[in-house]
C-alpha cells in the first residue's frame, strides 16, 4: 500500500504536489508499512477495540485562514474516554475518584507503556529498533523523553504527508508559500503504541484556507451606542474603527501596513498607518464604509526576464555583471516583497441619538413625615440629541463597583429635554449614582458621587420650615468625570 491508499480516498496528482510543495513533507506515493501500522477501513469492527474503555476522539484545529507565505499551525488534541488521562510519563491512567460506567478501577493504568520492557526489544546499540519507526520506515527522532511519546500522528494534505511522534497533543506548522489558494483538506490519522506495533485509534479531517487577501476584521464602537453589533450608530459622535489583522504567525510583523478608508459620506479617502481611526458622521442615513489594507509582505521573486534571442555567432566573453540575465528568483537568500491587500466593507446606518447627559441640579426633598433612614433626592437632568424614552439609575458604593439598587422607568420628556429624577437613599453615607438616559439606539451615561448625612427629626422639621435653607449641611454633591463628560453640578439653595 501507498500513503495515499491509506490516508485519502483518491490518489492525488503529481500536479497537486508540484503546485503545493510543503517543506519537509513527503510524497504520498511512498510505501506504507502495513505490518507495523495496520490499515482499517471505516466501519471495520476492530475500531471498537482499538482503545480500552471506549473510543478516542481526535480534535483537529488550525489558525486558518492563512495569508499565502505565512505559516499555518495545526493542533491535534486527543480526547480520551471519561476518567482517562495521560500522566507525566506518557502512560494513560484513570483519574482518581472518577467513576465511569465500569465504576472505580482497581488498576490505575489504562495503558502502562513504561512497564513494557525497553531492554528486550532487539535494539542495536543506538537505541534504535525495527519497530521504532514511522509508517514510511524513517526512524523516530530521539528527542529527550521520546520514549514517553506513545502516539504516532500522520498528517496528510495536498498529496503529501508528515509524520510526528507525540503525546496527547501535537502541533504542526506548515509554510504556505507554495500552496494553492482556496480551501484545502487536512487529514490526520493517529496510531498508539501496541507492543512492537501500532494500532489506529482515531482519524480526523478539517478544512483550512489559504488566501492572498489579508484577513481583516474591523470592530466598530461608539460612546452612547446601545448595540455595537447592529451597525447602527449615532450622528455627531465619533465612531472608533479598530482594524484587526488575522496574522497568528506574525508574517506581517516587519511589514509597513497602510489603511485606506472611505467612509461613504463624501469626506474623501483617509489614509493612515494606524490601525485605529475615529470618524464622525454629521448626517443621518445609510453609508457604505470601505477599507483597503495594504502590506508589503515577503513574497516570491519575479521570474527572470526571458533570455534574449540567440546571437548569430558565439560571444567571445561574458558582458559586465549588469548584463547578466540571471533572474531574481535564482539569487540565493532572496528577499523580495509583494503587495498584499485586505478588504473590509460594511453598510452602516446613522441615526439621531442621545449625545450627552448632565445632572444640573441635586435637591434634597423635604418630607413632612420623614422615614427614619430614608432620604429622597431629586436629580435635575438635561440632555442633548434625541429625546430619551427611559431613565435608569444605579446606586452603588463609593467605588461605583458594588450595586445596591437599580431602577429603570419610562419617561416622557419634552423637546427641551429637561427632567427630574427622584431617588431614595437608605441611610447616610457616600453613594455613587450612575444615571443613564436611553432610547432605541442610544444610551447616555453620567455619574456623580453624593454624601447623605445622618438626619434627625429636628433637622428635618427645621429644613421643612425654613424652605430648605440649609441643604448644604444635609448633603454635598461631588463631581465625577465619566467618559470625558464634564458635569456641572449646581447646589440649590
Amino acid at each position: 500500500k501507498r500513503f495515499h491508499d491509506v490516508l485519502g480516498n483518491e490518489r492525488p496528482s503529481a500536479y497537486m504536489r508540484e503546485h503545493n510543495q510543503l517543506n519537509g513533507w513527503s510524497s504520498d506515493e511512498n510505501d506504507w508499512n502495513e505490518k507495523l501500522y495496520p490499515v482499517w477501513k471505516r466501519g471495520d469492527m476492530r475500531w471498537k477495540n482499538s482503545w480500552k474503555g471506549g473510543r478516542v476522539q481526535a480534535v483537529l484545529t488550525s489558525d486558518s485562514p492563512a495569508l499565502v507565505g505565512s505559516n499555518i499551525t495545526f493542533v491535534v488534541n486527543l480526547v480520551f474516554p471519561r476518567c482517562q488521562k495521560e500522566d507525566a510519563n506518557g502512560n494513560i491512567v484513570y483519574e482518581k475518584n472518577c467513576r465511569n460506567e465500569a465504576g472505580l478501577s482497581a488498576d490505575p493504568y489504562v495503558y502502562n507503556w513504561t512497564a513494557w520492557s525497553e531492554d528486550s526489544d532487539g535494539e542495536n546499540g543506538t537505541g534504535q529498533s525495527h519497530h521504532n519507526v514511522f509508517p514510511d520506515g524513517k526512524p523516530f527522532p530521539h528527542h529527550p523523553g521520546w520514549r514517553r511519546w506513545n502516539f504516532v500522528y500522520v498528517f496528510h494534505t495536498l498529496g503529501q504527508y508528515f509524520q510526528k511522534l507525540g503525546r496527547c497533543s501535537v502541533r504542526v506548522s506548515v509554510n504556505t508559500a507554495n500552496v494553492t489558494l482556496g480551501p484545502q483538506l487536512m487529514e490526520v490519522t493517529v496510531y498508539r503504541r501496541h507492543g512492537r506495533a501500532y494500532v489506529p485509534i482515531a482519524q480526523v479531517k478539517d478544512v483550512y484556507v489559504v488566501t492572498d487577501q489579508i484577513p481583516v476584521f474591523v470592530t466598530m464602537s461608539q460612546k452612547n451606542d446601545r448595540n455595537s453589533s447592529d451597525e447602527t450608530f449615532l450622528k455627531d459622535l465619533p465612531i472608533t474603527f479598530d482594524v484587526l489583522i488575522h496574522d497568528p504567525s506574525h508574517f506581517l510583523n516587519y511589514s509597513t501596513i497602510n489603511y485606506k478608508w472611505s467612509f461613504g459620506d463624501n469626506t474623501g479617502l483617509f489614509v493612515s498607518i494606524n490601525h485605529t481611526v475615529n470618524h464622525t458622521y454629521v448626517l443621518n442615513g445609510t453609508f457604505s464604509l470601505n477599507l483597503t489594507v495594504k502590506a508589503a509582505a515577503p513574497g516570491p521573486c519575479p521570474p527572470p526576464p526571458p533570455p534574449p534571442p540567440r546571437p548569430p555567432k558565439p560571444t567571445p566573453s561574458l558582458g559586465p555583471a549588469g548584463d547578466n540575465p540571471l533572474g531574481l528568483s535564482e539569487i540565493p537568500d532572496e528577499n523580495c516583497q509583494i503587495n498584499r491587500y485586505g478588504h473590509f466593507q460594511a453598510t452602516i446606518t446613522i441615526v439621531e441619538g442621545i449625545l450627552e447627559v448632565n445632572i444640573i441640579q441635586t435637591t434634597d426633598v423635604l418630607m413632612l413625615v420623614p422615614g427614619p433612614d430614608s432620604s429622597l433626592i431629586d436629580f435635575v437632568v438635561t440632555c442633548q440629541g434625541s429625546i430619551p424614552t427611559e431613565v435608569c439609575t444605579i446606586i452603588s458604593d463609593p467605588t461605583c463597583e458594588i450595586t445596591q439598587n437599580a431602577v429603570c422607568s419610562p419617561v416622557d420628556v419634552d423637546e427641551m429635554c429637561l427632567l427630574t429624577v427622584r431617588r431614595a437613599f437608605n441611610g447616610s453615607g457616600t453613594y455613587c449614582v450612575n444615571l443613564t438616559l436611553g432610547d432605541d439606539t442610544s444610551l447616555a451615561l453620567t455619574s456623580t458621587l453624593i454624601s447623605v448625612p445622618d438626619r434627625d427629626p429636628a433637622s428635618s422639621l427645621r429644613m421643612a420650615n425654613s424652605g430648605g435653607g440649609g441643604l448644604n449641611d444635609i448633603f454635598e454633591a461631588q463631581k465625577i468625570e465619566w467618559h470625558e463628560h464634564h458635569h456641572h453640578h449646581h447646589h440649590h439653595h
Epitope: 496528482s13 500536479y15 503545493n20 489558494l181 492572498d212
Partner: antibody
Framework: QVQLQQPGAELVKPGASVKLSCRAS????????LHWVKQRPGQGLEWIGE????????NYIEKVKTKATLTVDKSSSTAYMQLSSLTSEDSAVYYC????????????WGQGTLVTVSA | DIVMTQSHKFMSTSVGDRVSITCKAS??????VAWYQQRPGQSPKLLIY???YRYTGVPDRFTGSGSGTDFTFTISSVQAEDLAVYYC?????????FGAGTKLELK
C-alpha cells in the same frame, strides 16, 4: 459567471512579437492558475504553460521557454502571453483556460485568439 | 512527458448508438484524466474530470471510466449535437498533455 475574454485575431509579421490578452471576470482572479493552450488549424490541443496570478509563478513546456512569456496584471484581472520571433509554425488559435484549484482540468476557456503570421 | 494515445482518429456512429472512445497513457496517471468536446469553431468544453466525474450540467449520457493507464469515454445514446472532436487530457503532471483527438462523425 466566470468569463475569459480574448481578442478574436492578431495578424503579425514573421520575426515580430505579439502579446495576447485574456481578461478574467466572475471569480477571484488570483485564486486559480491560468493556462494557455495552442491549436494549429485542423490539429489537436497543445498545452503551452501556466501562470499563478497571485505571485507570478510560471511553468512552460520545454520547447516554448524561449518563445512564450506569461505575465499578469492583477489590477485589471488580465493574463498575457507574449510570443516572440514569430514564424509560420506559430500560426494557431491560442486559448486561455482556467484550472480547478489543485486540479489541472479546464472548466472555463476563452474564445481563443487566432494568430496569423504572414508577411 | 506523458503521452496520451487516442487510437481512433475517426469514429463513425449513428444517432441513438452507444459509442466508446479509448485513451491510453504512457504511464499510470490514475485517476487524473479529463475528457473534452470541441465542436467546429468553438472552444473545448469539459465533460469529464478525474476519470469518472461528470462536470456540472453535462448530460448523464456522457460517462468516463478507467484507471492506471487505460481510460474510456462513453456516450450511451449519441445525439446529433454530439458530433464533434473528443480529446482526453492527463491532469496528473506537468507538462499537461492531450490526446490527438477522436472525431465522431455520422455513418
Amino acid at each position: 459567471q466566470v468569463q475569459l475574454q480574448q481578442p478574436g485575431a492578431e495578424l503579425v509579421k514573421p520575426g515580430a512579437s505579439v502579446k495576447l490578452s485574456c481578461r478574467a471576470s466572475g471569480y477571484t482572479f488570483t485564486s486559480y492558475w491560468l493556462h494557455w493552450v495552442k491549436q494549429r488549424p485542423g490539429q489537436g490541443l497543445e498545452w503551452i504553460g501556466e501562470i499563478n496570478p497571485s505571485d507570478g509563478r510560471t511553468n512552460y513546456i520545454e520547447k516554448v521557454k524561449t518563445k512564450a512569456t506569461l505575465t499578469v496584471d492583477k489590477s485589471s484581472s488580465t493574463a498575457y502571453m507574449q510570443l516572440s520571433s514569430l514564424t509560420s509554425e506559430d500560426s494557431a488559435v491560442y486559448y486561455c483556460a482556467r484550472s480547478g484549484g489543485n486540479y489541472a482540468w479546464f472548466a472555463y476557456w476563452g474564445q481563443g485568439t487566432l494568430v496569423t503570421v504572414s508577411a | 512527458d506523458i503521452v496520451m494515445t487516442q487510437s481512433h482518429k475517426f469514429m463513425s456512429t449513428s444517432v441513438g448508438d452507444r459509442v466508446s472512445i479509448t485513451c491510453k497513457a504512457s504511464q499510470d496517471v490514475s485517476p487524473s484524466v479529463a475528457w473534452y468536446q470541441q465542436r467546429p469553431g468553438q472552444s473545448p468544453k469539459l465533460l469529464i474530470y478525474s476519470a469518472s466525474y461528470r462536470y456540472t450540467g453535462v448530460p448523464d449520457r456522457f460517462t468516463g471510466s478507467g484507471s492506471g493507464t487505460d481510460f474510456t469515454f462513453t456516450i450511451s445514446s449519441v445525439q446529433a449535437e454530439d458530433l464533434a472532436v473528443y480529446y482526453c487530457q492527463q491532469h496528473y503532471s506537468i507538462p499537461l498533455t492531450f490526446g490527438a483527438g477522436t472525431k465522431l462523425e455520422l455513418k
